[in-house]
């Protein structure tokens, strides 16, 4: 199992800081964090050492290490808290896309452990969230929307408590996906039309579900026929 | 609000074992890192042993001074970390203190006192 | 293993006074210092950590300062509350090790 440096769990910084982070393995060793400027890599053998001398609010994120030649698959991981008094948030991505019924994980993470307290969920213009929003918060993570509906596709934004007032992240789009329970039902009418060449005719393709997001298309044995 | 508290501390012989507890609150233990730090006015503070979290395999560490001696472990159920002392020496004797790692020793409980002495 | 030498390890001083506490590290630790304070029958407590940041509820009197091998705690306006024992304490890797400590004691 790799072991990174320093040996702490959360680290807090200031930003401009110099930061290091070193991984050692038994073997090679990889990084993984969120995408952010600045970090330059140096690899050597079995250790690996991630460096930058102008920490931002963007590096704000987990780092984790992993041995890709351990069969056990261990890692290790170290949070890092860039600490911004103008940028309490850093957005990881500006777009969710999760099917119904799945947790949605809005990526915006807290640049300062000591914010937390005061951190709350809205959606944009800050109108409140839906009736019935089941949500949780992480500092390492983001806020988490349990078990989300078709109805909660909205823009949200994440919002935190920095002297007495509130300090709003960029957006975050959130779309959830209805489940298909099954093949739609397809009707074709009528069954049987009979017309003389040159004739109008009146072919009805219908589908149920049509809030799901599904192609309807004739087909006449293998040619797509424009409607 | 975090509370950390140790027990089991004791006089014990040369070469006889204890086991101290911590009862950890107020905190996700199962998230937590834990460590025993202990002091002598010899010594001064010193590091003993760590068990990180879960998601960090349950991995442990030892001070020089203590490898194959003790055992630190933990049960996330309980939120309750354990160190198993065996082949007691004096120079073991000190207050143990159990801590809580985040940024740095975040946490530390009030300390159990043990004298090794014959 | 990284050693830790703290200096002075004691120091008389009146209320009021500024005072500043350091600490070596044998080789590089990259700002990964912790600072604690020790009252007198207490347990430690957490001042700085990361070299430069305040623990949560330390007055601002407090500072850290210091990169590579060389650390420093600094308390302006000393206050009655700040006597007792400092320590420093580095993060990188394990064994952790602390430094001697700093007793400070009122003149």
């Known amino acids: 199992i790799p072991v990174i440096e320093p040996s702490v769990p959360e680290l807090v910084v200031k930003p401009g800081a110099t930061v290091t982070l070193r991984c050692v393995g038994n073997g090679s060793v990889e990084w993984d964090g969120p995408p952010s400027p600045h970090w330059t890599l140096y690899s050597d053998g079995s250790s690996s050492i991630l460096s930058t001398n102008n920490a931002t609010f963007q590096n704000t994120g987990t780092y984790r290490c992993t041995e890709p030649g351990d069969p056990l698959g261990g890692s290790a991981a170290i949070h890092l808290y860039v600490k911004d008094p103008a940028r309490p948030w850093n957005v990881l991505a500006q777009e969710v896309v999760v099917f119904e019924d799945q947790d949605a994980l809005l990526p915006c993470l807290l640049t300062d452990p000591v914010l937390e307290a005061g951190v709350s969920l809205v959606r944009v213009r800050g109108r409140p969230l839906m009736r019935h929003t089941n949500y949780s918060f992480s500092p390492w993570h983001g806020f988490t929307i349990h078990r989300a509906k078709f109805i909660q596709s909205q823009d949200y934004q994440c919002s935190a408590l920095m002297g007495g007032r509130k300090v709003m992240s960029i957006s975050i789009r959130l779309k959830v996906q209805k489940v298909i329970p099954g093949p739609p039902a397809l009707t074709l009418v009528p069954a049987e039309l009979v017309r003389i060449r040159g004739e109008a005719a009146q072919i009805v393709c219908s589908a149920s579900s049509v809030d799901v997001n599904f192609d309807v298309f004739l087909q006449h044995n293998n040619t797509k026929l424009a409607i | 609000e975090v509370k950390l508290e140790e027990s089991g501390g004791g006089l014990v012989q040369p070469g006889g074992s204890m086991k101290l507890s911590c009862a950890a609150s107020?905190?996700?233990?199962?998230?937590?890192?834990m460590d025993w730090v202990r002091q002598s006015p010899e010594m001064g503070l010193e590091w003993v042993a760590e068990?990180?979290?879960?998601?960090?395999?349950?991995?442990?560490f030892y001070a020089e001074s203590v490898k194959g001696r003790f055992t630190i472990s933990r049960d996330d159920s309980k939120s309750s970390v354990y160190l198993q002392m065996n082949s007691l020496r004096p120079e073991d004797t000190g207050i143990y203190y159990c801590t809580r790692v985040k940024v740095g020793f975040d946490n530390w409980g009030q300390g159990t006192t043990l004298t090794v002495s014959s | 293993d990284i050693q830790m030498t703290q200096s002075p390890a004691s120091l008389s001083v009146s209320v009021g006074e500024t005072v500043t506490i350091t600490c070596r590290a044998s080789?590089?630790?990259?700002?990964?210092l912790a600072w604690y304070q020790q009252k007198q029958g207490k347990s430690p407590q957490l001042l700085v950590h990361?070299?430069?940041n305040l623990a949560d509820g330390v007055p601002s009197r407090f500072s850290g300062s210091g990169s590579g091998t060389q650390y420093s705690l600094k308390i302006n306006s000393l206050q009655s509350e700040d006597f007792g024992s400092y320590y420093c304490q580095h993060f990188w890797g394990t064994p952790r090790t602390f430094g001697g400590g700093t007793k400070l004691e009122i003149k």
């Open positions: 107020g905190f996700t233990f199962s998230d937590a890192w």
């Open positions: 068990i990180r979290s879960k998601a960090n395999n349950h991995a442990t």
């Open positions: 080789e590089n630790i990259y700002s990964n």
């Open positions: 990361a070299a430069t």
